[in-house]
Structures are given as C-alpha cells and as structure tokens.
C-alpha cells in the first residue's frame, strides 16, 4: 500500500499558485507524484510522475473554485488522492508593494507600486484585479515603538512637517476594504529628514 502525500497545501502569492506536499515515508523506494486539476468534470494532469514535491497551477483562472488533487506512486501501485479546493482571487496572498521614497527637507515623498501578477507577460498588477485596492502605510521614528497608519487615496503620499534631522521608517501594504483583506508589508525604508525650509520672519 502506497501512503498518500502529506501536508498538501497551496502556496499562492500574487496568483503564482504552487501546490506543495511532502513525501511520506516509504520503505520500498523513491515515490513519484501526479497532480491534477478538475476542468469541467474531468481531472486533467498537470504534473505527471514527478519526483518533485510541488506543482505549478498558476495557469488556472483567477476567478473560480478549483479542485486539485495529488497522489503518490510506486511502480504499478498508487496512493489515494489527496484533494484540496482553492479559489485564487479569494485565497492568494497579496505580496508586498514596491515603494519609492524621496526626502525633501522635512517631508517624505512616497510612491507605491502594486505587486505584479506573477508569470504574465504584460504588466497587469494586483490593483487591476481588485477593484477596491488601496494602500495602508505605516511610519515611525526609527528607534521608537509608536507607529502611525495612514490610508493614501492615490499611488503616492507625502508625510509633511516631520522633525528635521530625524530618521523615519516607512512600509506599505495592499489592502482590500471590501474583503477586509490585507497584504504583506513591504520591507521598511528608513530615510533621514533634513532641515525645515520655513524661513524665520
């Protein structure tokens, strides 16, 4: 009896959908695996007789509930199928946006770049797919614990009237208000403000 794959899960970030599993202990030899997806009542092979423990399902429609399954094989024997269901538009993880930060005196000027949909040629982004897409920004003085959050209305934001000659850190994430779903935070970017440009009277 061939044991089934273990810890079967979908690792999906920005619609790059990788089905992953672990090979079970099996004394007779090395196992291979076949992974399939349900396409209009018929299961279609995606990865056949692979020695890998993952399979790329990124071509599946972003919109729809998909049934995927994987089994282990050895010679003419095979395990039972392990099934999972997956809806990319609901389940994919929203990766961190890009961010450009520029210091102008006592202000930080930020521009945000929505994460790209993985593995497509064109520059479609997660913002294209989700109508309610917005950004959350959090910033703080470097070395302090107190963080401030803002929700920019556009793909850019300016933090004004900051303390001069002070290092501020900023990070951004995508947020979908209609789904109450937050993406991953970008790595913090820390920049030092310069002088206050106001001229004394």
């Amino acid at each position: 009896m061939v044991p089934p794959p273990e810890n079967v899960r979908m690792n999906s970030v920005n619609f790059k959908n990788i089905l992953q599993w672990e090979s079970p202990a099996f004394a007779k030899g090395n196992l291979t695996f076949t992974a399939q997806y349900l396409s209009y009542r018929i299961f279609q092979d995606k990865c056949m007789n692979t020695t890998l423990t993952e399979c790329d399902f990124s071509s599946l429609s972003k919109y729809g509930d998909h049934t995927l399954r994987v089994r282990a094989e050895f010679a003419d024997e095979h395990s039972d199928w392990v099934n999972i269901t997956f809806c990319p538009v609901d389940d994919t993880i929203i990766g961190p946006p890009g961010m450009q930060v520029e210091v102008l005196a006592d202000s930080l000027h930020m521009r945000f770049l929505a994460p790209k949909i993985e593995n497509e040629y064109e520059t479609w982004t997660m913002k294209n797919v989700y109508n309610s897409w917005t950004y959350n920004v959090q910033y703080w003085k470097n070395g302090t614990d107190e963080k401030f959050q803002i929700t920019p209305q556009y793909d850019f934001e300016v933090l004004r009237n900051l303390e001069p000659w002070t290092t501020y850190c900023v990070q951004v994430r995508g947020f979908l208000p209609d789904r109450n779903k937050a993406g991953e935070w970008s790595e913090p970017v820390c920049e030092q403000t310069t002088h206050d440009e106001t001229v004394p009277s």
């Epitope: 279609q44 429609s61 919109y63 497509e120 064109e122 479609w124 294209n128 797919v129």
Partner: nanobody, 126 residues
Framework: QVQLQESGGGSVQAGGSLRLSCAAS????????MGWFRQAPGKEREGVAA???????RYADSVKGRFTISKDNAKNTLYLQMNSLKPEDTAMYYC????????????????????WGQGTQVTVSS
C-alpha cells in the same frame, strides 16, 4: 463583472461556413485572454481556439486550417470564422474570457478561463 454574449450560430450544410461573435463587457477588453469552446451532446466541453491579449492564437488539431479566431478590441468582440464545416463540428459553442491575462500560460483548458457566455448552437448536416 464580465459579461459575454455569443451569436451567429445556426444550421448549415457540410462544407458551409458560419461566423460566431462574442460581445464582451465589464473589463478593459484588451486585457482578456479569450477562447472558443464547444460541447457536443453527451461529450465533454473542449477547447476549439484561443487568443491571448497579445494576439497570439492556438487551435485544436481538429479545426486547424478551417477555423480562425480573431478579436476586434475597438468593438469588444471576439470572432470565430468557421469554414469547411463538418457534421462532427455540431455542438454548442461557448465564448470564454480570463481578464488580466497575457500570453504567459497558453491557456486552452476550461479551468483556465473564469467567465463564460451562455452558448450558441451550431448544427452541421450532411
């Protein structure tokens, strides 16, 4: 929400021609990958032809040289020109779309398209 509406089906003699249309609304049309599928009675739905947002096309072996897929971005319409029709082409023909898609995956399978029309019937008699 993407909406697709097929038209142009009908009855024709073997060797004849038909042109199917699929009017799309609800998304930036140029971002679609689109396809034509068909389903004969008692059979599974199968891919006929597909076109990516960059204009590259693919065909099922059974229709190569006879069918041509095209799209008019200005009219938000997908077409399937079917020539030299055969009785085995008889089926319900469906238009399908996957928004925000390019040529990266060469989509041809039902599960790779998220939005579907209601279908138009094509009947080819001998």
């Amino acid at each position: 929400q993407v909406q697709l509406q097929e038209s142009g089906g009908g009855s024709v003699q073997a060797g004849g021609s038909l042109r199917l249309s699929c009017a799309a609304s609800g998304y930036t049309y140029s971002s679609y990958c689109m396809g034509w599928f068909r389903q004969a009675p008692g059979k599974e739905r199968e891919g006929v032809a597909a076109i990516d947002s960059d204009g590259s096309t693919r065909y099922a072996d059974s229709v190569k040289g006879r069918f041509t897929i095209s799209k008019d971005n200005a009219k938000n319409t997908l077409y399937l020109q079917m020539n030299s029709l055969k009785p085995e082409d008889t089926a319900m023909y469906y238009c399908a779309a996957e928004p925000y898609c390019s040529g990266g995956y060469k989509r041809t399978m039902v599960a790779e398209f998220g939005y579907w029309g209601q279908g138009t019937q094509v009947t080819v008699s001998s």
